[in-house]
Interface confidence: medium
């Protein structure tokens, strides 16, 4: 229903704490370079204004849209052009073009230093002195680095952060308590960030219909006892919520997400038998719990999918009369029977089914033509199954770091033009799929692996789109979202690439590497590995193993030496010479 004052309506629905958090996230995602202090000042001004509108919805400016109010605030920032360049041009536009312009200027790879976690004692002190400010900084730092992070979910992670600090800061060994718990929150949040970016990419590039198809498949897997109309109601709501968040309408998005959770909990009987535990939780935890809910049990007596979609004499008539309903029902029926498939695979099968009907229903004997369609799914199903098998076997053999290196070599060979930092980031993330998915039961591996890889490859596409350098990457990224992962998997060594000159400074290291944390050490080594492959794209696995082994020994030896600097200075050139020789 329409409200006199949109901002008052959202403030009342969300409550002051969540309202302020969401406004802070919105501003941090739009203006990623502004310091926390500047954003928090704006947040307070917006909150005070919202309160005046709650008191009197007819007060001046209370009838303005939230985009107008937020945009006016952002455009009033002094020195906007100095700090943001052409983003300031957005301010000359009217809504809704102004908001669209802000969205287009979101930077997926902002030039910000990696978020450094303070030392445990210092962290606890600042948390205990001012928890609100501490958590505000967390929201700001995550949101500006991840401008598409799903805002209500980020509030949930801030709540988790709060819980961990509240618990651990009273312990005698604060670091021992904090480190593993905060690492776990960070890991989950980073995965959430790439998953949400994929959803926004889907929405931006392919529109609501494509996103709704994704949601239908996902909901059907989770809630196989819900009927199709229920599934499409949920899918429609989830599509609207994601569209709002991807579009910067964070208050509406969070409000609608809470509404959906309420609806699901009020209609458990027609959705799933697994919801009750989630429904007893407070709002942020409830929504998060529902988003992560385990699959309900598949009904025991489901008939063969062939009955309605292959054997029925009326297949072409049904398809012609109501294409969307017929294909939607096919996707629903197939997905509810296959929680063991990835959503990407289910969408590929639905696409194959549609293409088959398009072709066959125009022919003389349609049933003879589409009669084998389910058998034709087999190769499409086998391809990702083999991918999972071979990659999980490799992961089990090499461990996470070794597996990341294998992926890094593979992807540098596929797209050597891509910048080394981007390749290293992508390979490290792709390599984590082993730890994340390969330890799961067989039935959960495929959906875990493929849907995670798709999200990571989407990040690669988003970064590559900013500065396109590889035709092969552009080709895979331009196609349909569900075909991306198979497209990347099918890429081979880029034969058009002219190998990079061998630069000694790329492989010159200093004693500062010795004091780096393990993760940073790994990144240094992986950077060297990518550069090696760029120099010798056709180097064999054994050659690369030799050089990298040599390199690891060199670092280890010099870091143990009494005069580290001297060791690096003298042994370094020897290493470079040996490496060149080994790769000749």
């Amino acid at each position: 229903e329409a409200h006199k004052s949109e901002i008052a309506h959202r403030f009342k629905d969300l409550g002051e704490q969540h309202f302020k958090g969401l406004v802070l996230i919105a501003f941090s995602q739009y203006l990623q370079k502004c310091p926390y202090e500047e954003h928090i000042k704006l947040v307070q001004e917006v909150t005070d204004f919202a309160k005046t509108c709650v008191a009197d919805e007819n007060a001046e400016n209370c009838d303005k849209s939230i985009h107008t109010l937020f945009g006016d605030k952002l455009c009033a920032i002094p020195k906007l052009r100095d700090n943001y360049g052409e983003l300031a041009d957005c301010c000359a536009k009217q809504e809704p073009e102004r908001n669209e312009c802000f969205l287009q200027h979101k930077d997926d790879n902002p030039n910000l230093p990696p978020f450094q976690r303070p030392e445990a004692e210092a962290m606890c002190t600042s948390f205990q002195e001012n928890p609100t400010s501490f958590l505000g900084h967390y929201l700001h730092e995550v949101a500006r680095r991840h401008p598409y992070f799903y805002a209500p979910e980020l509030l949930y992670y801030a709540e988790k952060y709060n819980e961990v600090l509240t618990q651990c800061c009273t312990e005698s060994d604060k670091a021992a308590c904090l480190t593993p718990k905060l690492d776990a929150v960070k890991e989950k949040a980073l995965v959430a960030a790439v998953r949400q970016r994929m959803k926004c990419s889907s929405m931006q590039r392919f529109g609501e219909r494509a996103f709704k198809a994704w949601a239908v498949a996902r909901m059907s897997q989770r809630f196989p006892n819900a009927e199709f109309a229920e599934i499409t109601k949920l899918a429609t709501d989830v599509t609207k919520i994601n569209k709002e968040c991807c579009h910067g309408d964070l208050l509406e998005c969070a409000d609608d997400r809470a509404e959906l959770a309420k609806y699901m909990c009020e209609n458990q009987a027609t959705i799933s038998s697994k919801l009750q535990a989630c429904c007893d939780k407070p709002v942020l935890q409830k929504s998060q719990c529902l988003a992560e809910i385990e699959h309900d049990n598949i009904p025991a007596d489901l008939p063969s999918i062939a009955a309605d979609f292959v054997e029925d004499k009326e297949v072409c008539k049904n398809y012609a009369e109501a294409k969307d309903v017929f294909l939607g029902t096919f996707l629903y029926e197939y997905s509810r029977r296959h929680p063991d498939y990835s959503v990407s695979l289910l969408l590929r099968l639905a696409k194959k089914y549609e293409a088959t009907l398009e072709k066959c229903c125009a022919e003389g004997d349609p049933p003879a033509c589409y009669g084998t369609v389910l058998a034709e799914f087999q190769p499409l199903v086998e391809e990702p199954k083999n991918l999972v098998k071979t990659n999980c076997e490799l992961y089990e053999k090499l461990g996470e770091y070794g597996f990341q290196n294998a992926v890094l070599v593979r992807y540098t060979q596929k797209a050597p033009q891509v910048s080394t930092p981007t390749l290293v980031e992508a390979a490290r993330n792709l390599g984590r799929v082993g730890t994340k998915c390969c330890t799961l039961p067989e039935a959960q591996r495929l959906p875990c692996v493929e849907d995670y890889l798709s999200a990571i490859l989407n990040r690669l596409c988003v970064l590559h789109e900013k500065t396109p350098v590889s035709e092969k990457v552009t080709k895979c990224c331009s196609g349909s979202l569900v075909e991306r992962r198979p497209c990347f998997s099918a890429l081979t060594v880029d034969e058009t690439y002219v190998p990079k000159e061998f630069k000694a400074e790329t492989f010159t290291f200093h004693s500062d590497i010795c004091t780096l944390p393990d993760k940073e050490k790994q990144i240094k080594k992986q950077t060297a590995l990518a550069e090696l492959v760029k120099h010798k794209p056709k180097a064999t696995e054994d050659q690369l193993k030799t050089v990298m082994g040599d390199f690891a020994q060199f670092v280890d030896k010099c870091c143990k030496a009494a005069d580290k600097d001297n060791c690096f200075a003298t042994e370094g050139p020897n290493l470079v010479a040996r490496s060149k020789e080994a790769l000749a």
Epitope: E227, F228, A229, D308, N318, V325, E333
Partner: nanobody, 116 residues
């Protein structure tokens, strides 16, 4: 638009029985809630009964215990068995579903007249 076709209406004496049938595409009948509605002359259309894909049924209080809704997936048909009919059951009976992404689908209706 999806086609639903009702049959089985007619003239029957009070206390008598009739069985209405609604035929439609199998994929639709199996995956969606199917309902029977009725509209008596000069009155609003009202829900008589519905059946979910799971087999769960629901009835209007006025027909509870006298009418039974069922489905036969093999025949792609939904039935409404009407027993102990009364004069106030006289109406045009419509089969209905609401497939997602589409407007409601209604049949053309079948007339049931209860009179002595």
């Amino acid at each position: 638009q999806v086609q639903l076709v009702e049959s089985g209406g007619g003239l029957v004496q009070p206390g008598g029985s009739l069985r209405l049938s609604c035929a439609g595409p199998g994929f639709l009948l199996r995956s969606n809630t199917m309902g029977w509605y009725r509209q008596a002359p000069g009155k609003e259309r009202e829900l008589v009964a519905f059946i979910r894909p799971s087999g769960l049924t629901n009835y209007n209080d006025a027909v509870q215990g006298r009418f039974t809704i069922s489905r036969d997936n093999a025949k792609n048909t939904v039935y409404l068995q009407m027993n102990s009919l009364r004069a106030e059951d006289t109406a045009v009976y419509y089969c209905h579903t609401r497939p997602p992404f589409q407007r409601d689908s209604w049949g053309q209706g079948t007339l049931v007249t209860v009179s002595s």
